[in-house]
């Protein structure tokens, strides 16, 4: 039988039964929040083999191995993670061994073992038989492996009875509890499976199978299943679902969901059955299976209840995420904010048509209306009082629309208005109406010049750039002396300067009233001799990055209700120069031959330029009388070299309280102080555990529906 | 956790109609896929009839196509099995199953069941 689509078993045991007749839970696993200890034993799921996404484990009290309850859970194929993870265990108390003893796969994913105060037989189970890579486990804050005293079956009798591999270079005996051995096939089957008794299983087996080489008797599948049978890929006509068997299209059309998408059913992409189209493709009419590609963003279209939708908060546009077409009004009223104006591009920059009007009154905070980086059509088919579709009132830090140079929008009906916008130059204004087609449609007071403006500097002369310098981390930039009418009018410069990996920045990005500025900015006094031209050195920048540059002069912005000129430059790239990059990352060598090296390494993370070869040193070193003092033919153990890992054993510390020099006569040493780097890992590794575990909080603890 | 109550269940003509109600209690309603099974005496459950989150998508089983209608009130938490031309063989106990974001065709582990009511179709 198969259940899902996932199962979480929480806050009463008895729910447990829900999995009585499950041999395949098409989903994840969760168990948690059971805060009354029971008693597990009368519960036991012996058919349970097989898990396509997770199974997590967190706050199940009384709960002290699952052996007992999953004794033939056999693969967890990590289809979907838990952030990152296929097995998550998380503050179980009484947990005394995981004891999956029949555990032989996990397909995807890591496991996260952590906060479970009595846990023990970790340190006996090899991962590396059961996930491809353990690099990314996480086992941590669980019972102290001094504590434990784990013990493999007949280890005790000295007529051990599991087999031994070497982790971190401790090689050992295999065990899941005291009493179950961790199975390992032969070396024969290699990456397959084996049966009870050791015969090889199918190639399409995954984890073990009931009768050798034979792909109907498998556990699981490797691939794929269908009628029966293990198969390297889905027959024609069959389509791949939940990452694990093969369904036709009429078991396709006939899911049912409960999720807001369901009106339209699953589809069939890609040769997969899936509940939607994936990004960048759209369903080829509203009742249809298949999906075609998207010319352009996919897209939206939401509606207002209400027929007009208010901008007044990051809230309210966040429900505009991803609409491309918006049908009804758009009233923006952003008085004040954090970052406002990248935050209202992140959920409004994909819309494209506005149905009704546009109404922008009242928001101090925005500097530009750029943030609505794709509109490019307002229908006017509801229009305000007096027919106006794009009404701009009393927005007191408004200087740009739109980058007119870069941007086609059309108002198809109606009349623009703009009143009280006193840092938005009328040429401005007028510019739009030349780009939107509205020219002629505005009567003489729907654009006011007297208030529009009023207290910018709108003829703008252009400051040209007299030199550029640069080096691997500093740029020095000067330009023409400005010289307005009158000179007392200039007061200083400003510079602004970013990163810009394209050639595409406008002067108004990220940028808002509220002190949010993707620009760096600095100041530049006039220099006191008027024959020097004004520069300035940029310093503390990354080696070969392009920047974006652009130089304001500061002037008086009215003189006796007169407008005056302002002047800034165009925006320059320029990229610093190259450097020597940092360090190659993770090398690694092995000895493939009683000749031959192989070295592998990862790229640096900063290279600060374009990285042509690498230099690659080698040399011959000693060979080390260690290895020659220790009978290897003798059965005691092999001694392990140890490392100082450059962390410190509390209770070691504690036993060794006296300072001692180290050398002469041999006595006990203080651990050395934690390097800046050690100290910066203990932070990120906080930081990531905190982060964990705001995210199980954040997916378990949901309101209670209404 | 849901709690699930069938009523509308009794004895009925064949040929005759009959509306079988389920009473959801609980969270999210709209949240879970319901259907109807059946199980007739000495015989093993059958599934009679699905229906989505949202009531616009409904799945039937052959025996019961063009007979039966399923339909949902999520306003009300309630949901419906409208059965026409009643015959002999549709002589069951009827449940009332629900399943949390999804059902496929070979779902029989609903993860909710109520306790069921006996629909008896004789002359």
């Known amino acids: 039988e198969i259940c899902g689509p996932g199962i979480d078993i929480r806050n009463d045991y008895q729910q447990l039964k829900r999995l009585e007749n499950c041999t395949v839970i098409e989903g994840y696993l969760h168990i948690l929040l059971i805060s009354k200890a029971e008693d597990y034993r009368s519960y036991r799921f012996p058919k349970l083999t097989v898990i396509t996404e997770y199974l997590l484990l967190f706050r199940v009290a009384g709960l002290e191995s699952l052996g007992d309850l999953f004794p033939n859970l056999t693969v967890i194929r990590g289809w979907k993670l838990f952030y990152n993870y296929a097995l998550v265990i998380f503050e179980m108390t009484n947990l005394k061994d995981i004891g999956l003893y029949n555990l032989r796969n996990i397909t995807r994913g890591a496991i996260r073992i952590e906060k479970n105060a009595d846990l023990c037989y970790l340190s006996t189970v090899d991962w590396s038989l059961i996930l491809d890579a353990v690099s990314n486990n996480y086992i941590v804050g669980n019972k102290p492996p001094k504590e434990c005293g784990d013990l493999c079956p007949g280890t005790m009798e000295e007529k051990p009875m599991c087999e031994k591999t070497t982790i971190n270079n401790e090689y050992n005996y295999r065990c899941w509890t005291t009493n179950r051995c961790q199975k390992m096939c032969p070396s024969t089957c290699g990456k397959r499976a084996c049966t009870e008794n050791n015969e090889c299983c199918h190639p399409e087996c995954l984890g073990s199978c009931s009768a050798p080489d034979n792909d109907t008797a498998c556990v699981a599948c490797r691939h794929y299943y269908y009628a029966g049978v293990c198969v390297p890929a889905c027959p024609p006509n069959t389509y791949r679902f939940e990452g694990w068997r093969c369904v036709d299209r009429d078991f396709c059309a006939n899911i049912l969901s409960a999720e807001s998408s369901d009106s339209e059913g699953f589809v069939i992409h890609d040769g997969e059955c899936m509940q939607e189209c994936p990004s960048g493709f759209i369903r080829n009419g509203s009742q249809s299976m298949y999906c075609i590609p998207c010319e352009g963003p996919c897209p939206k279209v939401c509606e207002e209840e209400k027929k007009t939708k208010t901008i007044d908060s990051v809230t309210s546009a966040q429900m505009l995420q991803g609409c491309t077409i918006f049908k009804g009004n758009l009233l923006i009223n952003i008085r004040r904010g954090n970052n406002i104006a990248s935050e209202l591009e992140n959920f409004m920059g994909l819309i494209e048509v506005v149905t009704g009007y546009v109404k922008i009154r009242h928001s101090h905070a925005l500097v530009s209306l750029s943030f609505l980086k794709n509109l490019r059509l307002i229908l006017g088919e509801e229009q305000l009082e007096g027919n106006y579709s794009f009404y701009v009132l009393d927005n007191q830090n408004l200087q740009q629309l739109w980058d007119w140079d870069h941007r086609n929008l059309t108002i198809k009906a109606g009349k623009m208005y703009f009143a009280f916008n006193p840092k938005l130059c009328v040429s401005e204004i007028y510019r739009m109406e030349e780009v939107t087609g509205t020219k002629g449609r505005q009567s003489k007071g729907d654009i006011n010049t007297r208030n529009n403006g009023e207290r910018a500097s709108c003829e703008s002369d252009v400051l040209h750039f007299t030199s550029t310098t640069t080096s691997k981390n500093r740029i020095i930039i000067t330009w023409h002396r400005y010289r307005p009418p009158d000179y007392r009018d200039l007061i200083s410069f400003t510079v602004y300067y970013k990163e810009a990996p394209f050639k595409n920045v406008t002067e108004y990005d990220g940028q808002d009233a509220c002190g949010s500025n993707s620009w760096n900015m600095v100041d530049v006094d006039l220099p006191p001799n008027k024959d020097v031209e004004p520069g300035i050195l940029l310093h503390g920048l990354k080696p070969w990055t392009q920047y974006a540059v652009y130089v304001k002069a500061v002037t008086l912005t009215m003189v006796e209700n007169d407008h005056i000129r302002g002047a800034k430059s165009e925006i320059l790239y320029i990229r610093t120069n190259a450097s020597v990059p940092s360090i190659p990352l993770d090398v690694l060598s092995a000895s493939n031959s009683s000749s031959q090296l192989i070295v592998k390494w990862n790229p640096p993370s900063l290279p600060n330029g374009n990285l042509s070869y690498y230099i690659v040193r080698w040399q011959r070193q000693p060979q080390d009388g260690y290895l020659y003092r220790h009978n290897y033919c003798s059965k005691d153990k092999i001694p392990i070299r140890k490392y100082a890992d450059g962390t410190i054993d509390i209770e070691e510390v504690t036993e060794n309280p006296k300072t001692e020099v180290c050398g002469g006569e041999k006595g006990p040493c203080c651990a050395c102080p934690k390097t800046e780097a050690e100290k910066q890992a203990e932070k990120e590794e906080a930081e990531y555990r905190k982060v964990f575990e705001n995210f199980l909080h954040n997916s378990i603890f949901v309101p209670r529906p209404e | 956790e849901v709690q699930l109550v069938e009523s509308g269940g009794g004895l009925v003509q064949p040929g005759g109609s009959l509306r079988l109600s389920c009473a959801a209690s609980?969270?999210?309603?709209?949240?879970?896929?319901m259907a109807w099974f059946r199980q007739a005496p000495g015989k093993g459950l059958e599934f009679v009839s699905a229906?989505?989150?949202?009531?616009?998508?409904?799945r039937y089983a052959d025996s019961v196509k063009g007979r039966f209608t399923i339909s949902r009130d999520n306003s009300k938490n309630t949901l419906y099995l409208q059965m026409n031309s009643l015959r002999a063989e549709d002589t069951a106990v009827y449940y009332c199953a629900a399943n949390p974001r999804r059902a496929t065709p070979d779902l029989t582990q609903y993860a909710y069941w109520g306790q069921g009511t006996l629909v008896t179709v004789s002359s």
């Open positions: 229906i989505s989150g949202s009531g616009s998508r409904a």
């Open positions: 609980g969270p999210a309603f709209s949240s879970f896929v």
